[in-house]
Interface confidence: medium
């Protein structure tokens, strides 16, 4: 179930997945929630005596059992991911941090009259992930009322330092407040030749687009279908970026599908989850568990309720079926996407719905009868 | 259109602009509304780009420069290229587009009448070609829809001008002996219409020609009257498929 409480002066031991810098525990919890494997986190609000670079450290963790041993540590805050917290799920982070310099790659500097104006500039710049604003009281006159737009490979600061009269915050694109616009176009049989920032395996271009939308540096994508001539690239989703923020003109390429990230959308922004169940498809990955259930929908529900499950394959092969149902393999991977997709007539596959805002359940508490 | 003049809004309400939307958007061809959900155009427009998703169809438009990302457009539901069309031969240069959603007819956007099969030998005297294409061989797409009146040329005479090509009975030629007025690049797929017995008919689909508006080189058009059966059959079979897949 949903565990939203935070534990003060507590640090989880072991289970380390990744470490990033975040300005507070709430932001750290959000980063853990949207990380494919993170279940627990520990945040250092105060730096240990000899390790000043550890302050603002957000340590993302996983555990087979869903819990880790707790140790007392002054200034540490720990908690759980909100992966199963339905209505509390949001990537939007509107808080402003006074006296903090969130560092990253400064790609633009301009004069603005207010912190709100600076945040708006960041929200409406395709590359901006976070910003720092120097107030009129900043110690260096030439930087006063300057708005620095920033980015990094992870989408989070590369370090955070306390500096008087600096104010920092995040882009509000994830709050659906960007005015950049929302390019919904999907180009069948066209490929973008721009810089790849990452690649994942996906069953179709729509999942690819959602993955791109929630990747910190993906602006557009090219997905190669199962018919693509290079076997190693079949069902591969290439996440792309460019200096200009726009793709170069697409090139005609049979069995390629291209499109844009929807991270600047206001209304059409997708949820970070994929509802569709793909029949005739098997998702490969690290096996978590196998149960026997009746139907692919029930398999998806089992995966959704199993917090570490990222995707599943339901098999209808005679040897995989018993009286109580057929085999439901619960799986996971490092990036949350299948390691490989194969086509098998007797299989159905899909994803956990743990990151959907409202998880649909087949059993409703109130039944409304149609007239 | 070479040697043409500006049209006015609603003068040719069946004319549409077929545009390809990639990173930028460009007018590629013309087309004609023949039904609420149907556009008739040239098959060669889709050579190398037979992907319905990238095409956008604009009706009720006079000036292409007024198209913005807010301008409504139609998308292709089904692209039907004549099964015998081969790029290297130029015959059967005809395609039907079924639109995703039916068009609303207005005074600026309505269909053109198709000729009947009996019109294969009709002599038309008042014919016009329209489009946003080049105004010279080495030119550029025009913003305002151009129009030009143009006389039909008998096939035997047309064949004499094109010794290297076969002018089939499924083609119709139009042009002036001295040149100067003709369709050109970007007018492809658009209409050659003639007024007969008080109404406009779609007589030809802009297809090909040696250069543009050259002396003794008429424009060659797909003769619509020769394809009436094909058009009706394709529209009918599309309707039947829709009935098969519609909910009970």
């Amino acid at each position: 179930g949903c565990l939203s409480q935070l534990y003060a002066n507590t640090f989880f031991r072991g289970g380390d997945l990744a470490a990033i810098y975040t300005p507070d525990a709430q932001h750290c919890q959000k980063m853990c929630t949207f990380h494919p494997r993170c279940l627990l986190f520990s945040f250092l609000a105060v730096s240990p005596t000899k390790e000043t670079d550890k302050r603002f450290g957000c340590f993302m963790k996983e555990s087979i059992t869903g819990t880790l041993p707790r140790i007392h540590r002054t200034g540490a805050i720990s908690g759980h991911s909100l992966k199963q917290c339905g209505h509390q799920l949001s990537a939007c982070h509107q808080d402003i941090y006074e006296g903090l310099d969130m560092r990253g790659s400064n790609f633009n500097i301009s004069k603005t009259d207010s912190i709100e104006e600076c945040q708006k500039l960041c929200t409406n710049n395709i590359h901006c992930q976070f910003f720092t604003y120097a107030t009129k009281a900043f110690h260096r006159p030439e930087y006063r009322k300057s708005c620095l737009l920033k980015r990094s490979s992870s989408g989070t600061p590369t370090s955070i330092k306390p500096v008087d009269n600096l104010v920092s915050g995040f882009s509000l694109k994830s709050c659906a407040l960007s005015e950049i616009g929302c390019p919904m176009d999907i180009f069948q049989h066209f490929a973008f030749a721009d810089l790849n920032v990452s690649h994942v395996v996906t069953p179709d271009a729509f999942v690819c687009r959602t993955v791109c939308t929630f990747h910190p540096n993906c602006l557009f994508f090219t997905f190669y279908t199962n018919e693509w001539e290079t076997e190693s690239q079949r069902n591969v989703c290439f996440l792309k970026t460019s200096k200009s923020g726009r793709p170069s003109p697409p090139i005609i390429q049979e069995n390629a599908v291209s499109g844009y990230s929807l991270f600047t959308c206001r209304k059409a922004r997708p949820e970070p989850c994929h509802f569709k169940i793909y029949s005739g498809v098997a998702f490969e990955g690290e096996e978590l568990n196998a149960t026997f259930v009746q139907g692919a929908d029930a398999c998806q529900e089992t995966c959704t309720k199993t917090i570490r499950c990222q995707f599943f394959t339901y098999s209808l092969l005679p040897q995989d079926c018993k009286a109580e149902g057929c085999k439901c393999s619960l799986r996971l991977s490092t990036d949350g996407s299948p390691t490989r997709i194969t086509y098998e007539a007797q299989g159905s596959s899909g994803y956990s719905l743990r990151l959907c805002k409202v998880v649909e359940s087949s059993d409703c508490t109130t039944k409304i009868n149609a007239r | 259109i070479v040697g043409g003049t500006n049209s006015s809004l609603g003068e040719w309400p069946w004319q549409v602009s077929l545009q390809v939307k990639l990173v930028s958007q460009n007018h590629m061809c013309g087309g004609s509304i023949i039904g609420r959900q149907w556009i008739l155009t040239a098959a060669h427009c889709f050579d190398g780009i037979p992907y319905p998703d990238v095409w956008r169809i604009y009706g009720g438009i006079l000036n292409l420069s007024e198209i913005t990302n807010k301008t409504p457009f139609s998308s292709i539901k089904e692209l039907i290229i004549h099964q015998k069309y081969k790029m290297s031969e130029g015959s059967y240069d005809i395609a039907l587009i079924k639109l995703q959603t039916p068009l609303n007819y207005t005074e600026f956007q309505k269909p053109i009448c198709l000729p009947s099969k009996a019109d294969t030998n009709t002599i038309y005297t008042n014919c016009w070609v329209t489009g946003w294409g080049y105004t010279k061989e080495r030119g550029e797409t025009q913003n305002i829809l151009q129009k030009a009146t143009i006389p039909l040329v008998p096939n035997e005479e047309c064949q004499k001008k094109y010794r290297d090509y076969v002018i089939t009975k499924q083609m119709i030629c139009a042009g002036y002996k001295e040149g100067g007025i003709d369709a050109c690049k970007g007018d492809s797929g658009g209409p050659l219409v003639c007024k007969h017995s008080g109404r406009w008919q779609l007589v030809g689909i802009t297809s090909w020609g040696e250069g543009c508006a050259r002396k003794e080189q008429p424009g060659v058009y797909t003769k619509v009257a020769e394809y009436i059966d094909w058009i009706l059959e394709k529209i009918q079979s599309s309707k039947e498929r829709a009935l098969e897949t519609s909910p009970a």
């Epitope: - | 061809c29 060669h44 190398g48 090509y165 007018d187």
Partner: antibody, heavy 126, light 107 residues
Framework: EVQLLESGGGLVQPGGSLRLSCAAS????????MIWVRQAPGKGLEWVSY????????TYADSVKGRFTISRDNSKNTLYLQMNSLRAEDTAVYYC???????????????????WGQGTLVTVSS | DIQMTQSPSSLSAFVGDRVTITCRAS??????LNWYHQKPGKAPKLLIY???RLQSGVPSRLSGSGFGTDFTLTISSLQPEDFGNYYC?????????FGGGTKVEIR
């Protein structure tokens, strides 16, 4: 299957003449434009001459104009290149090729060369 | 005459690499540009016509783009059989001119 086979190449002295032939099969020869292209040893491609399907219109590169003549015999499915007043700089492999697009579509025109022969070597040397 | 300038004149790449060759015309040529591939001792082979249209039988890892004066040939994932020389050619006006060629070697 489309096939083009050149012949008639060889060694010739400067000022001499040669006649190249290109035998075509596997397509309706009389319906296609034909082209000669040459390639000097270790160099790039150079377009030489072009002839329309009926033979009614021909064009030449400036470097060969007045010395070379392109012709065709549609009854024999053969293309020819008569080369007179040959110079050392005419030394090359000569390819015949088929013109790919017959029509000047109103939205597409490209005189591309879709099938090529294997070439015949012409050496002009004293 | 229209001059066609290709770059680079040669390149060396690994199997699986994305390779891009550019061709620039000395004056605008609309989309009247073709690309050919030639292996040593063999005749050239047509790859792409009218700037971006793939000749039938050519693998779709090859693609072309461009309009006016600047054109690009892209091989999305270089294969061993892709070595050799690549030429662009304009068909906008006679004389039809070729680029100087790009030699592609497999590392």
């Amino acid at each position: 299957e489309v096939q083009l086979l050149e012949s008639g190449g060889g060694l010739v002295q400067p000022g001499g003449s040669l006649r190249l032939s290109c035998a075509a099969s596997g397509f309706t020869f009389s319906a296609y434009s034909m082209i000669w292209v040459r390639q000097a040893p270790g160099k790039g491609l150079e377009w030489v001459s072009y002839i329309r399907p009926s033979g009614g219109r021909t064009t030449y590169a400036d470097s060969v104009k007045g010395r070379f003549t392109i012709s065709r015999d549609n009854s024999k499915n053969t293309l020819y290149l008569q080369m007179n007043s040959l110079r050392a700089e005419d030394t090359a492999v000569y390819y015949c090729a088929r013109g790919g697009l017959l029509l000047w579509f109103r939205e597409l025109k490209s005189n591309y060369f879709d099938y090529w022969g294997q070439g015949t070597l012409v050496t002009v040397s004293s | 005459d229209i001059q066609m300038t290709q770059s680079p004149s040669s390149l060396s790449a690994f199997v699986g690499d994305r390779v891009t060759i550019t061709c620039r015309a000395s004056q605008p040529i609309d989309n009247y540009l073709n690309w050919y591939h030639q292996k040593p001792g063999k005749a050239p082979k047509l790859l792409i016509y009218a700037a971006s249209r793939l000749q039938s039988g050519v693998p779709s890892r090859l693609s072309g783009s461009g309009f006016g004066t600047d054109f690009t040939l892209t091989i999305s994932s270089l294969q061993p059989e892709d070595f050799g020389n690549y030429y662009c050619q304009q068909s906008y006006t006679v004389p039809y001119t070729f680029g100087g060629g790009t030699k592609v070697e497999i590392r």
